[in-house]
């Protein structure tokens, strides 16, 4: 299976490193410093 | 309250097959992947099978890959362990399990945080 | 592949003594700075049941006087004060992301 965070969740975090999450068939972001949500914004 | 209840155990010979089912409860049953851990007789945990939420993705060890293959229907909280080719080191009792998890700043932290009671599988001729 | 492997294989303690069973994985089980080690308590005739999960974290409803420590490779579930109720086989688990997700073989606890 292709990884999301490389095709239409490659702009989704903002200020952080998308990653996903297998298990749960999701994706989140691992923020940079200072930002916090979903989408580190 | 969650509940795991495993059936379709039971006596097979070398080479047979047969289907487990879990039925789920009390809990959104598509919101967590799913895992099949045996026991055999006297011995200690080995993880079988895990599914993800969607069944899009699928995970085995090396002793059963290509022999049994894990599935769920989420619109009947169920989740299958279809095990073909049987020998006799599959006999145990077979746990289905709920992966429970954190994921908080982009980790992932999981665990199996409810058991059923087990059904056993004997592979006897 | 990472092998978990557990010692003692089998432990006497008595009530009220301190019992602490060790789990030693062949690579690293960490991710910056997070540990993906769980332990498991079977007592007979019964389904595993979590105690700790990401190495220290008491599972809900767990009594206090479990306790789990360690990273990287070396952890240890300690019980403070051994109950009889505490007899049972207990397990460690990792849990990082790649797959097979082993078990170590377990270790029987005992009242001495």
């Known amino acids: 299976k292709k990884n999301p965070c490389n095709a239409e969740f490659q702009n989704f975090c903002i200020h952080g490193e998308c990653k996903y999450i297998e298990h749960l068939e999701a994706v989140t972001c691992k923020c940079q410093q200072e930002y916090f949500g979903e989408r580190c914004g | 309250e969650v509940q795991l209840v495993e059936s379709g155990g039971g006596l097979v010979k070398p080479g047979g097959s047969l289907r487990l089912s879990c039925a789920a409860s009390?809990?959104?049953?598509?919101?967590?992947?799913m895992s099949w851990v045996r026991q055999a007789p006297g011995k200690g945990l080995e993880w079988v099978s895990t599914i993800s939420t969607g069944g899009s993705h699928t995970y085995y060890p090396e002793s059963v890959k290509g022999r049994f293959t894990i599935s769920r229907d989420n619109a009947k909280n169920s989740l299958y362990l279809q095990m073909n080719s049987l020998r006799a080191e599959d006999t145990a009792v077979y746990y289905c399990a709920r992966h429970g998890y954190l994921l908080y700043e982009g980790y992932y932290e999981w665990y199996f945080d409810y058991w059923g009671q087990g059904t056993l599988v004997t592979v006897s001729s | 592949d990472i092998v978990m492997t557990q010692s003692p294989d089998s432990l006497a303690v008595s009530l009220g003594e301190r019992a602490t069973i060790n789990c030693k994985s062949s690579q690293s089980v960490d991710y910056e700075g997070h540990s993906f080690l769980n332990w498991y308590q079977q007592k007979p005739g019964q389904p595993p049941k979590l105690l700790i999960y990401a190495a220290s974290n008491r599972e809900s409803g767990v009594p206090d006087r479990f306790s789990g420590s360690g990273s990287g490779t070396d952890f240890t579930l300690t019980i403070s004060s051994l109950q009889a109720e505490d007899v049972a086989v207990y397990y460690c688990?990792?849990?990082?992301?790649?797959?097979?997700?082993?078990f170590g073989q377990g270790t029987k606890l005992e009242i001495k």
């Open positions: 688990q990792q849990s990082t992301e790649n797959p097979p997700y082993t």
């Open positions: 009390g809990f959104t049953f598509s919101s967590y992947a």
